[in-house]
Interface confidence: low
């Protein structure tokens, strides 16, 4: 009963987590304009993995996709890749775990097969969660780096040298959604792995008891699982979305006259 509950709860938690990862990936508010120095601004800029938006005080919002692929920074591409890999692994994990659920009977599926499937889906959820957490963390690291690098810069404006302060971007809602969702998926995966230990065929348990009466009965021992994000901290001063293909009908995020779309 406890195994079924653990497995079911792991599935539900992972499902919520993966839904959150999908939501975070699609959200536009990965980075939002820092309003610390300008709280009453008429225009508010925010950016996602796929497009950049501006919202006017009237409530009018306009978004534009990043029309270039090659021009986008490698780190942004890496974040996109991590999130997509997380979603794909999570989706496959969900599919596998549905068939692995103890409460669902599919033909004459062996308990050992269910145990293996539960473990497989659990590992997939763990990797999916780690991908999402890594992706969000890499993006957050880019933001932190750029935030402190955004000091006053000189550039030529309409006819003369103009002193401007670059817009600073801070953490958007999508980052928090991504972290929480990745964490939930990770927890769900761990729960699935734990549940798989109690899903071994019953005769194995009896044999374990009869042959090792004085010892602990261990029905199923999954191999050790070690996951690593493989990402170090990004210390390069790399502006987000720099070097994108610019078009003549783009106007820029506050306060630069050049948009990175």
């Amino acid at each position: 009963m406890a195994v079924t509950a653990c497995q079911g709860l792991g599935f539900v938690v992972s499902l919520i987590g993966i839904a959150g990862i999908i939501a975070a990936t699609c959200m536009d508010q990965w980075s939002t304009q820092d309003l610390y120095n300008n709280p009453v601004t008429a225009v508010f800029n925010y950016q996602g993995l796929w497009r950049s938006c501006v919202r006017e005080s009237s409530g009018f919002t306009e978004c534009r996709g990043y029309f270039t692929l090659l021009g986008l920074p490698a780190m942004l591409q890496a974040v996109r890749a991590l999130m997509i890999v997380g979603i794909v692994l999570g989706a496959i994990g969900l599919l596998v775990s549905i068939f692995a659920l103890k409460c669902i009977r599919i033909g004459s599926m062996e308990d050992s097969a269910k145990a293996n499937m539960t473990l497989t889906s659990g590992i997939m959820f763990i990797v999916s969660g780690l991908c999402a957490i890594a992706g969000v963390s890499v993006f957050a690291n880019m933001l932190v780096t750029n935030f402190w690098m955004s000091t006053a810069n000189m550039y030529t404006g309409m006819g003369g040298m103009v002193q401007t302060v670059q817009t600073r971007y801070t953490f958007g809602a999508a980052l928090f959604v991504g972290w929480v969702a990745g964490g939930l998926t990770l927890i769900g995966g761990v729960m699935m792995c734990i549940a798989c230990r109690g899903l071994a065929p019953e005769e194995t348990n009896y044999k374990a008891v009869s042959y090792h009466a004085s010892g602990h009965s261990v029905a199923y021992k999954p191999g050790g699982f070690k996951a690593s994000t493989g990402f170090g901290s990004n210390t390069k001063n790399k502006k987000i979305y720099d070097g994108g293909a610019r078009t003549e009908d783009e106007v820029q995020s506050y306060p630069s006259k050049h948009d990175y779309v």
Epitope: V54, E62, R64, T164, D249, Q252
Partner: antibody, heavy 118, light 112 residues
């Protein structure tokens, strides 16, 4: 809300210059691209020039090349349009208009009437 | 330069009736980014112009839904479903696909 406030009416002699100002409030001038448009009495709109974010420079309409200069002073949030060698045909209402982010003409100044008369 | 041609130049309409203005460009307004930068401006008597429609069919904030834009490539239309007294003025189409920006000659909408 973004507001553009232009300087008052001007009366000039032929051959003189006029400098029209356009003060931006509610947002930082450097975030906007400023366009200048004029409208002669009873006529349509005519684009004079403005900032092109792709090239990072101000583009002037061929008709006004060499006679018009567009500048901005970010410390005061004011854009300027100076038209020299005025002729009677330059009598018009001069407007500043912004292009904010993705599209043109979001906000307009109230217009500055310039009369060129001897 | 892209030439914008509007028809009709004058449109007398009855209050509550629909009105339609056409705009044709001398070349396609489809930008390399896939967008079509065609806007419609309204200029009421004694006032500066204001943005009504941008990117062919998107209404700017505060614009009543009786205004709609349509078209593609080189042919565009502004429609007013039911003309109201406050709609009197001159309407301009303008392209934002390339520099220099160019305007149509304007269409005067007046009440019969």
């Amino acid at each position: 809300q973004v507001q553009l406030v232009q300087s008052g009416a001007e009366v000039k002699r032929p051959g003189a210059s006029v400098k029209v100002s356009c003060r931006v409030s509610g947002y930082t001038l450097t975030a906007l691209s400023m366009y200048w448009v004029r409208q002669a009495p009873g006529k349509g709109l005519e684009w004079m020039g403005g900032f092109d974010p792709e090239d990072g420079e101000t583009i002037y309409a061929q008709k006004f090349q060499g006679r018009v200069t567009m500048t901005e002073d970010t410390s005061t949030g004011t854009a300027y349009m100076e038209l020299s060698s005025l002729k009677s045909e330059d009598t018009a209402v001069y407007y500043c208009a912004t292009r904010l982010r993705y599209f043109d003409w979001n906000y307009w100044g109230q217009g500055t009437p310039v009369t060129v008369s001897s | 330069d892209i030439v914008m041609t509007q028809t009709p130049l004058s449109s007398p309409v009855t209050l509550g009736q629909p009105a339609s203005i056409s705009c044709r460009s001398s070349q396609s307004l489809v930008h390399s980014d896939g967008n079509t930068y065609l806007s419609w401006l309204q200029q009421r008597p004694g006032q500066p112009p204001r943005l009504l429609i941008y990117k062919v069919s998107k209404r700017f904030s505060g614009v009543p839904d009786r205004f709609s834009g349509s078209g593609a490539g080189t042919d565009f239309t502004l429609k007013i479903s039911r003309v109201e007294a406050e709609d009197v003025g001159v309407y301009y189409c303008t392209q934002g696909t390339q520099f220099p920006r160019t305007f149509g000659q304007g269409t005067k909408v007046e009440i019969k």
